[in-house]
Every structure is written in C-alpha cells, then in structure tokens.
C-alpha cells in the first residue's frame, strides 16, 4: 500500500524558519503534490503549494519555495514574518497524486520539545485520505 | 466558463465603510485564491491582498493591513472585501482576480466596481 | 518588499511594427512574471506567466523572456487591438505590479 511521510523542521539558524519535507512511498508517478496547512487540502486547509513535474511550482506565502528532491518527494521553505511562531503548533499536510494509485495524503507538524535543527524522523504517519 | 461578477458602483462619504462583492462561478471556489486589486484613476494597479475560500485564509498587503478586510461565503461561492474608515484616497476601481495556481496568477478577473468618496 | 521599476511608461509604434517593454525587480524573482493587457472598462487580461509561457488564447505575437531580476516583453506584427496598458506582474513572494506601460499606435 502506498504511504506519504510528512517532516517538519525548525531551522537551526533561523528559528522563524521551517521546512516541510515530505515524500511518497510506493509505484507509480507523481502527477501532482499538493502542500496545505491547517488542516487536509479541501478541508479546511490553506493551500501552501503546488508542484507538477512539468508545469512547474507555485508557492503562496508564507512559503518562500517550494522544489523536487527526488521524483518522489518534495521540500516547502517557509518564512514566519510574524512576532511569534504559529506554524509550531500548525499541521501540515501532503498530497501526493500518482499514477495509477490516486491520491494519498498524510500530515505532521513540528514535534512539540523540537530544537532548532531537529526534527522527527521520516516515518510513515497515518494515511488521511486515499481518492 | 469561469467568471467573476462583481457588485455595482458605489458613492459614499468619508468616514464610512463599504462592503464590495465578487461572485464566482465555473469552478470550485474553495480550490483557488481570491485577490483584490486597486486601480486609482490614472494609475497603475496594486495588491490588497488575498483569500483562501476553502478556509478563509488571508494575507494582506502591509499597505491595507486594518482598513481592508477579506471574507468569503462558500455557499454562495461569493469573496467580499470590506474597505473602513474611507477617505478620498479611496475613490478607485477594485477588481477581484483568482489565482489560477500553475495555470497562472490572477488568469481571470471581475470587471471592476467604481467606488468614488465624497462629501 | 519586491519592487518592479516597468519602462518605458508609454510608447508609440505603428501598425505591424514591434514593441518591448522591460521591468526590473530589485531581486532574483525566479522568473515569476506575469504580463496583463488592460483596456478601460475592463479587467486585465493575462497574456504571460512563468515569464514566457502563453495563456491559452493567447497569440505567439506576444512573448517574454527574461531570467534573474531582468524581464521583457515583446508584441510583433503591432494590431490595432493591441492599443492599451500593460503591466508586469511578480509574484515569486506576494504580488507586486509594475507601473504600466500605455501603448499606443501611430
């Protein structure tokens, strides 16, 4: 069955910056990646980005950029402009769409007792919706 | 098709405030973002600011950051901005624009509503 | 804030000639660039984005190029319908319009 791993990160140099990793397990091509915060892409959730691997991307801030690591994964840059830091206690989710599976997405967010530069481990979390 | 219908001309006086409308239709409104534009008479255009339908998102322009503010009702696929505390430096055309994602930003566009403040 | 300085702020051409038009950002915008036609009474209509990539509908007379914080904008074969202002558009962070630029045929 396929999976979608989320990570998000604080980063070390700079504590209003965050980097959301995340990526696809399983066969297939990626058609399209969907990166939203608050909650699931079209439900309730900001759009964050959008990556195809030919149209290209588009990121809305507070995403700063949005690019392909692999053929299977994806990383978001974002920037906090604000006083305090909202996206620490902000889910971020990733749908991945790939043929022939469909869609798979999964969310995390930033693990609570993170210091800069940690984060959680790349595993697997639970599935939220597969179309 | 997709079309973004806006509300009619507005006349009123300063120290008011006004509620502009864009209604969507052609697709689904909660998907795109919505964004308000300014054009002064004579000058060029400037970025308000957006909305997320799907979840009611905003970001403003630091700009209009306390004078304008977005809304949306998703049962009527309809994007309001509300503009307070209006002076004549008001008096513009809005447009409300979506962003069409990778197909590219603001690709479709209101026709514009006239608001003129005067005494 | 991104700024965009768009020039020149009008010109003249005549009919079937060429026309370009340039804008500045005052950073690396990664080619996130759009272009809009405007005629009065109207909404802007988007000719360009992705600095050169057509909107559907959009005649290959229009094109843009451009890479870093330097973009350009051409129309050939100049129309009659060509005649209105045209504005740059980044949107690598947030949104920032150029200042326009009239065109008008001689």
């Known amino acids: 069955t396929p999976e979608v791993w989320v990570q998000v990160q604080m980063e070390a140099t700079e504590l209003s910056s965050f980097t959301v990793h995340c990526g696809f397990l399983g066969p297939g091509s990626i058609s399209l990646v969907t990166v939203s915060w608050g909650g699931p892409d079209g439900a309730g959730g900001t759009k964050l980005a959008v990556l195809h691997p030919e149209l290209g991307t588009r990121q809305w801030a507070p995403a700063r950029q949005a690019r392909w690591e692999t053929q299977s994964s994806i990383s978001l840059a974002l920037e906090d402009s604000g006083a305090s830091s909202p996206f620490a206690n902000t889910t971020f989710c990733c749908k991945f769409a790939s043929f022939p599976e469909g869609s798979w997405e999964s969310c995390g967010s930033l693990p609570p007792s993170s210091d800069p530069g940690l984060s959680a481990p790349p595993t697997p979390v639970p599935i939220l919706r597969a179309d | 098709q997709v079309q973004l219908q806006q509300s009619g001309p507005e006349l009123v006086k300063p120290g008011t405030s006004v509620k502009i409308s864009c209604k969507a239709s052609?697709?689904?409104?909660?998907?795109?973002?919505i964004n308000w534009v300014k054009q002064r008479p004579g000058q060029g255009l400037e970025w308000i600011g957006w909305?997320?339908?799907?979840?009611?998102?905003?970001y403003y322009n630091e700009k209009f950051k306390g004078r304008a503010t977005l809304t949306v009702d998703k049962s009527s696929s309809t994007a309001y901005m509300l503009l307070s505390s209006l002076t004549s430096e008001d008096s513009a055309v809005y447009f409300c624009?979506?962003?069409?994602?990778?197909?590219?930003?603001?690709?479709?566009w209101g026709q514009g509503t006239t608001l003129t403040v005067s005494s | 804030d991104i700024q965009m300085t768009q020039s020149p702020s009008s010109l003249s051409a005549s009919l079937g000639g060429k026309v370009t038009i340039t804008c500045k950002a005052s950073?690396?915008?990664?080619?996130?660039i759009a272009w809009f036609q405007h005629k009065p009474g109207k909404g802007p209509r988007l000719l360009i984005h992705?600095?050169?990539t057509l909107q559907s509908g959009i005649p290959s007379r229009f094109s843009g190029s451009g890479s870093g914080g330097d973009y350009s904008f051409s129309i050939s074969n100049l129309e009659p319908e060509d005649i209105a202002t045209y504005y740059c558009?980044?949107?690598?962070?947030?949104?920032?319009f150029g200042g326009g630029t009239t065109l008008e045929i001689k």
């Open positions: 558009l980044q949107y690598d962070y947030l949104y920032t």
């Open positions: 950073q690396d915008i990664n080619k996130y």
């Open positions: 992705f600095t050169s």
């Open positions: 052609g697709y689904t409104f909660t998907d795109y973002y």
């Open positions: 624009a979506r962003d069409g994602g990778l197909r590219g930003p603001f690709d479709y």
């Open positions: 909305i997320f339908p799907g979840s009611g998102n905003t």
